[in-house]
Interface confidence: low
């Protein structure tokens, strides 16, 4: 049986090195062998030798860009030869290179990197198409560049100042189907600047008899600061509305501050400062006492989306695009130092994960209009990052006990063991030697009427509270109706 | 040609430290990897831990870490390895060795081309 | 960080073939190198990127390596073949090098 025709001829140049060149099939079932033919030097000269398997490398001297080569492969048995069809290969189209060496990476002014690198091989001035990817240390999403024509220095402009970054570099000819593979990585900083803008937010405390109030300052370094960013300290400088008089409090190292205020309105203003100069200013207006704030949230809701607690508000304006969210245990004595809060920006909705918060944990989160420096009304509500079953049942008593009927009432469980939010209470009942029996009543009913009881017949009842983690029983009481 | 001239041997007691240098010529010392492999008397190869001499970085065996340090001099392309708080059984021959430039086509990494002849160091109280 | 195993010694007569293997855990996924120290020299790289060859290795010298074995195949073997030969992979997690323990290979 004559061999197979060969096909599927493919071929790549591995760039100084060889011409590499595969076809099908790739087993032979009977004794094959094949004779390789390569045309080369635009069709002057010719290069054949015979190869067992169905691959061959041709060797360096044959394979010089820039050239039209051709190959053809011929199978041969002891029952005749078969010679494929002829193909042609531009070698710098299917040329691959090794990847490259990046010699140096260094920041230079304005957020860039300046890359400096070089190919394994002498690459005789083909022009060279480069991409750059880079990520920040602690992100897992590559952004790449591509450098058109590229030199062998490249310039990564875009950056985030004083910020890790990890970069690789591949390339491959302006004319060539195939990249090299990604370079080494190397890890460089970007130079570092002046510090970010901060979040700035405040609590206030009732104000006394003489208007006056203790307002605590808060701030810490904005979402989309530099990880690595350092400060040396913060200035504050507030005034009042009404007044030219500007106080300056400076060099203080805490990321909060306690001011004493009188009752009218305030601008409060705070700048954080390194060894290259200091930030904008984070500004904040704080309202007279007596002063109505606006309300701009419609409704709000909070729900579990594992891994999260995801809290969602609709807004009556569409300006509005900062909110402060603020949350803290309900159990919390007072609002500092429990209270933790974050800036959202551009959007109606906030998400934290479940692991930050404590478990059965009833948290009451605030969510504060912020319209340029002055804050609005804030809408709250309750939630907990994760329930749990009630630490306790619900204590019980039966009352109105008639020939058929009873009254069975429940004291709420206090907050501090629930665990959650009680969605429903269920009573269960039971005559001496009968079926259990229950019946279901929504979290506000404290008591339930049972009918329909035999007379003169002992029962055991007790009831379940049930939070979205499941039920707690409390204890079982025992009643006989009349005869 | 490219060759790694290392430091000559070294006896040392136990809990001090030893440096060990390397000098490299005949290529751009800054464009690849410089590994340190130690080998035991009469046991096998052991890897150390490399260092990139363009940028300083590092990468150490888990082994090593704390213990070991490799820094490098661009300006006389030499590096080096210092390892501390020595113990009996550090005792070796460190070799330093680059890492190649030998096309590798469907690697990503690659082997070590060039070796210096080692350095032995004795811990002996 | 991947174990490489390789057997302790490999004897063969001159002019015969030697194969020395070093088994990991799925080492066809992992690039492997060998190398060849004489005794009292530094070791020398004679395979690389699996079955490669750097410029002034004899052809006798050939690697292979899928599944969970890699080998290093010397034909034709000559008494200056006799070596320790150490097989080793990069941990693309870490970029850690690490060797097998060597094999010794004895030309009878």
């Known amino acids: 049986v004559l061999p197979t025709k060969p096909e599927n001829i493919s071929c790549v140049f591995y760039f100084d090195r060889n011409l590499t060149c595969t076809w099908r099939p790739e087993k032979e079932t009977n004794d094959t062998s094949y004779i390789v033919t390569l045309t080369y030097s635009y069709g002057k000269s010719n290069y054949s030798d015979n190869a067992t398997e169905a691959s061959y490398s041709f060797p360096r001297s044959c394979a010089m860009p820039p050239d039209i080569c051709s190959v053809e492969v011929q199978a041969q048995n002891g029952d005749g030869k078969v010679k494929s069809d002829i193909t042609y290969w531009h070698l710098i189209s299917i040329a691959k290179t090794e990847p490259p060496i990046i010699l140096s990476v260094n920041p230079i002014c304005n957020r860039m990197f300046q890359i400096q690198w070089k190919p394994r091989e002498k690459t005789r001035g083909f022009p060279l198409v480069c991409m750059l990817r880079f990520r920040t240390v602690n992100s897992s999403h590559w952004t790449e560049v591509n450098f058109e024509n590229c030199k062998q220095v490249c310039n990564l402009t875009g950056l985030q100042a004083f910020t890790e970054y990890v970069l690789a570099l591949r390339f491959r000819f302006n004319d060539s189907r195939y990249w090299s593979k990604w370079s080494k990585e190397e890890t460089r900083v970007t130079m570092e600047e002046v510090p970010h803008v901060l979040d700035l937010w405040r609590i206030l405390e009732p104000a006394d008899m003489n208007g006056d109030r203790k307002v605590r300052l808060l701030w810490k370094k904005a979402r989309g600061a530099p990880v690595l960013e350092k400060t040396f300290g913060y200035h504050i400088q507030y005034f009042a509305e009404n007044s030219t008089n500007l106080t300056e409090i400076n060099n203080i190292t805490t990321q909060q501050y306690e001011l004493l205020l009188m009752s009218q309105a305030h601008s409060v203003s705070v700048t954080s400062f390194n060894s290259l100069g200091k930030s904008q200013e984070a500004i904040l207006r704080i309202p007279d006492v007596h002063e109505k704030t606006f309300q701009y949230i419609k409704s709000m809701k909070a729900y579990i989306a594992e891994p999260l607690l995801v809290v969602n508000w609709q807004s009556s304006i569409p300006a509005v695009d900062t909110w402060i969210v603020e949350w803290l245990p309900e159990a919390a004595m007072s609002k500092f130092p429990a209270l933790s809060w974050e800036s959202v920006s551009q959007v109606t909705n906030w998400t934290i994960e479940q692991d930050k918060l404590k478990p059965f944990t009833c948290y009451n989160i605030s969510v504060y209009p912020v319209l340029g420096h002055r804050v609005g009304e804030p809408y709250s509500i309750q939630a907990y990052a994760k329930e749990g079953t009630p630490l306790k049942g619900p204590e019980t008593r039966v009352e109105n006990i008639g020939l058929r009927t009873a009254t069975i009432t429940w004291k709420e469980i206090p907050k501090s063991a629930r665990n959650g939010f009680i969605n429903n209470y269920t009573v269960f009942y039971q005559a001496e030697g009968g079926k259990e029996l229950s019946k279901t009543v929504n979290s506000h009913a404290l008591q339930c009427d049972l009918e329909s009881l035999t007379r003169r017949t002992s029962y055991t009842v007790w009831v379940m509270a049930s939070t979205r983690a499941g039920g707690t029983n409390g204890v079982r009481i025992n009643f006989k109706t009349l005869s | 040609q490219v060759q790694l001239v290392q430091s000559g041997a070294e006896v040392k007691k136990p809990g001090a430290s030893v440096k060990v240098s390397c000098k490299a010529s005949?290529?751009?010392?800054?464009?690849?990897?410089m590994h340190w492999v130690r080998q035991a008397p009469g046991q096998g190869l052991e890897w150390m831990g490399w260092?990139?001499?363009?940028?300083?970085?590092?990468n150490y065996a888990q082994k090593f870490q704390g213990r070991v340090t490799m820094t490098r001099d661009t300006s006389i392309s030499t590096a080096y390895m210092e390892l501390s708080r020595l113990r009996s059984d550090d005792t070796a021959v460190y070799y330093c060795?680059?890492?190649?430039?030998?096309?590798?086509?469907?690697?990503?990494?690659?082997?070590?081309?060039?070796w210096g002849r080692g350095t032995l160091v004795t811990v002996s109280s | 960080l991947p174990v490489l195993t390789q057997p302790p010694s490999v004897s063969v007569a001159p002019g015969q073939t030697a194969r020395i293997t070093c088994g990991g855990n799925?080492?066809?996924?992992?690039?492997v190198y060998w190398y060849q120290q004489e005794p009292g020299q530094a070791p020398v790289l004679v395979v690389y990127?699996?079955?490669d060859r750097p410029a002034g290795i004899p052809e006798r010298f050939s690697g292979a390596n899928s599944g969970n074995t890699a080998t290093l195949t010397i034909s034709r073997v000559e008494a200056g073949d006799e070596a320790d030969y150490y097989c080793?992979?990069?941990?693309?997690?870490?970029?850690?090098?690490?060797f097998g323990g060597g094999t010794k290979l004895t030309v009878l």
């Open positions: 060795a680059r890492e190649d430039v030998v096309p590798a086509a469907m690697s990503f990494y690659y082997g070590m081309d060039v």
């Open positions: 260092i990139n001499p363009n940028s300083g970085g590092t």
């Open positions: 799925n080492i066809g996924s992992k690039t």
């Open positions: 080793q992979v990069w941990d693309s997690s870490t970029d850690h090098g690490v």
């Open positions: 990127d699996d079955t």
């Open positions: 005949g290529y751009t010392f800054t464009g690849y990897y």
